[in-house]
Interface confidence: low
């Protein structure tokens, strides 16, 4: 069952799925000047059995110079339905853990892929949030959102995260006052 909506937006934060439930689809998008090969699948699909999950199909992009060098491939209407976007990142790894059963890892990049990946998430998917650089994460609870089915409709739970700038006071009891970083910005636990 596909999730109807996008995960919640948090000001000054981005989200990322780090493992993808079976049934998740990833559009085969190409960067400007390239298009999906004619015989290529429009999406990759996370499938699996009881012991192993992997992405079916492979995305392939070819130069569209022969046709229209500025045209960027856009999904067909059925591909656009319930499209989900996440920031393109390097492959995620769950620290020192085995793969999650029933989940696929982030697919490796393919040649000439678009800068943004468009996912179609399924019920049960979890996405994780982090503050953008220069903002500090304050937590009331999990910085994550889960797509759930309730009364026949899908919804994303609300991540309990606030990303605050250096001038904003802490709102959370039990939290230590932030120490200024050398460049004067508040340090964020997700900044590197």
């Amino acid at each position: 069952e596909l999730c109807d909506d996008d995960p919640p937006k948090i000001t000054h934060a981005t989200f990322k799925a780090v493992a993808y439930k079976e049934g998740t689809m990833l559009n085969c998008e190409c960067k400007r000047g390239f298009r999906r090969i004619k015989s290529g699948s429009p999406y990759m699909l996370c499938t699996g059995n009881s012991s192993h999950s992997s992405w079916d199909n492979q995305c392939q992009c070819t130069s569209s110079a022969a046709r229209n060098t500025t045209k960027q491939v856009t999904p067909q209407p059925e591909e656009q339905k319930e499209r989900k976007t996440t920031e393109m990142q390097s492959q995620m790894q769950l620290a020192d853990q085995v793969s999650l059963p029933g989940h696929c890892r982030e697919p490796p990049p393919w040649e000439n892929e678009a800068t943004e990946r468009i996912y179609h998430f399924v019920v049960g998917q979890t996405v994780y949030y982090q503050c953008v650089q220069g903002y500090r994460a304050l937590h009331r609870g999990p910085a994550e959102s889960v797509c759930k089915m309730t009364h026949g409709k899908t919804r994303w739970t609300q991540p309990q995260l606030i990303c605050t700038g250096e001038t904003e006071p802490s709102q959370f009891p039990g939290e230590e006052e932030p120490q200024a970083s050398p460049d004067g910005l508040p340090e964020s636990e997700t900044s590197r």
Epitope: K16, V18, A19, Q89, S90, Q91, M92, Q93, L94, A95, D96, Q97, T126, Y128, Y129, Q130, R136, A137, H139, R140, G141, P142, A143, E144, V146, T157, Q160, L161, F172, P173, G174, E175, E176, P178, E187, S188, E189, T190, S191, R192
Partner: antibody, heavy 130, light 107 residues
Framework: QVQLVQSGGGVVQPGRSLRLSCAAS????????IHWVRQAPGKGLEWVAV????????YYADSVKGRFTISRDNSKNTLYLQMNSLRAEDTAVYYC???????????????????????WGQGTTVTVSS | EIVLTQSPATLSLSPGERATLSCRAS??????LAWYQQKPGQAPRLLIY???NRATGIPARFSGSGSGTDFTLTISSLEPEDFAVYYC?????????FGQGTKVEIK
């Protein structure tokens, strides 16, 4: 193998200080938030503090805020708990425990211990008594 | 803070029997609940995370269920090594809190 080895407990008088250490090995220390959890004699578990993987964010239980300081030295794979102004009610076995985050080569996503506290230290006893 | 109440305080059972432990939260914690096992003189051990997911290396006889405010840890058939104290813990709100524990003892 994956382990957290604790040290630094002992008997101390009320009002005095003590520092606990928790040395990590067998895993990538910087991919984990680390907690301190304590257990008074014959009682249940009480969460004390947590520090984010790079040491920037620290949270405390109200019962220890202002008296205890959690810190970590990622170059030494070691976690610390500096306990000042100790009270009789701080008497307990103190455990350090790790919680994994999802990490890339560039950063960790603050999933807030999605997998629970999956590896614990052996515990160290702190007795506050006059 | 969220209060977790475990019941019963003590459960007296024989090896091979089924154990059902309850954890009730003072307000909804969604599915953000973990279960730990602790034996005398040892550190706690993670059994279940997020209400129903078995941690790495945990035998299939341990299962968790529930969401919102009511949760259950079930041990389908008690082994001698399962007699211990069990704690639930929520991560839905700061601060993280534990239940007071349920002791599973040999009858």
């Amino acid at each position: 193998q994956v382990q957290l080895v604790q040290s630094g407990g002992g008997v101390v008088q009320p009002g005095r200080s003590l520092r606990l250490s928790c040395a990590a090995s067998g895993f990538t220390f910087t991919n984990y938030a680390i907690h301190w959890v304590r257990q008074a004699p014959g009682k249940g578990l009480e969460w004390v503090a947590v520090i984010w993987s790079d040491g920037d964010n620290k949270y405390y239980a109200d019962s220890v805020k202002g008296r205890f300081t959690i810190s970590r030295d990622n170059s030494k794979n070691t976690l610390y708990l500096q306990m000042n102004s100790l009270r009789a009610e701080d008497t307990a076995v103190y455990y350090c425990a790790r919680t994994p985050w999802y990490c890339t080569s560039t950063n960790c996503y603050t999933g807030y211990y999605y997998y629970g506290m999956d590896v614990w230290g052996q515990g160290t006893t702190v007795t506050v008594s006059s | 803070e969220i209060v977790l109440t475990q019941s019963p305080a003590t459960l007296s059972l024989s090896p091979g029997e089924r154990a059902t432990l309850s954890c009730r939260a003072s307000q909804s914690v969604s599915s953000y609940l973990a279960w730990y096992q602790q034996k005398p003189g040892q550190a706690p051990r993670l059994l279940i995370y997020d209400a129903s997911n078995r941690a790495t290396g945990i035998p299939a006889r341990f299962s968790g269920s529930g969401s919102g405010t009511d949760f259950t840890l079930t041990i389908s058939s008690l082994e001698p090594e399962d007699f211990a104290v069990y704690y639930c813990q929520q991560r839905s709100n700061w601060p993280p809190t534990f239940g007071q524990g349920t002791k599973v003892e040999i009858k």
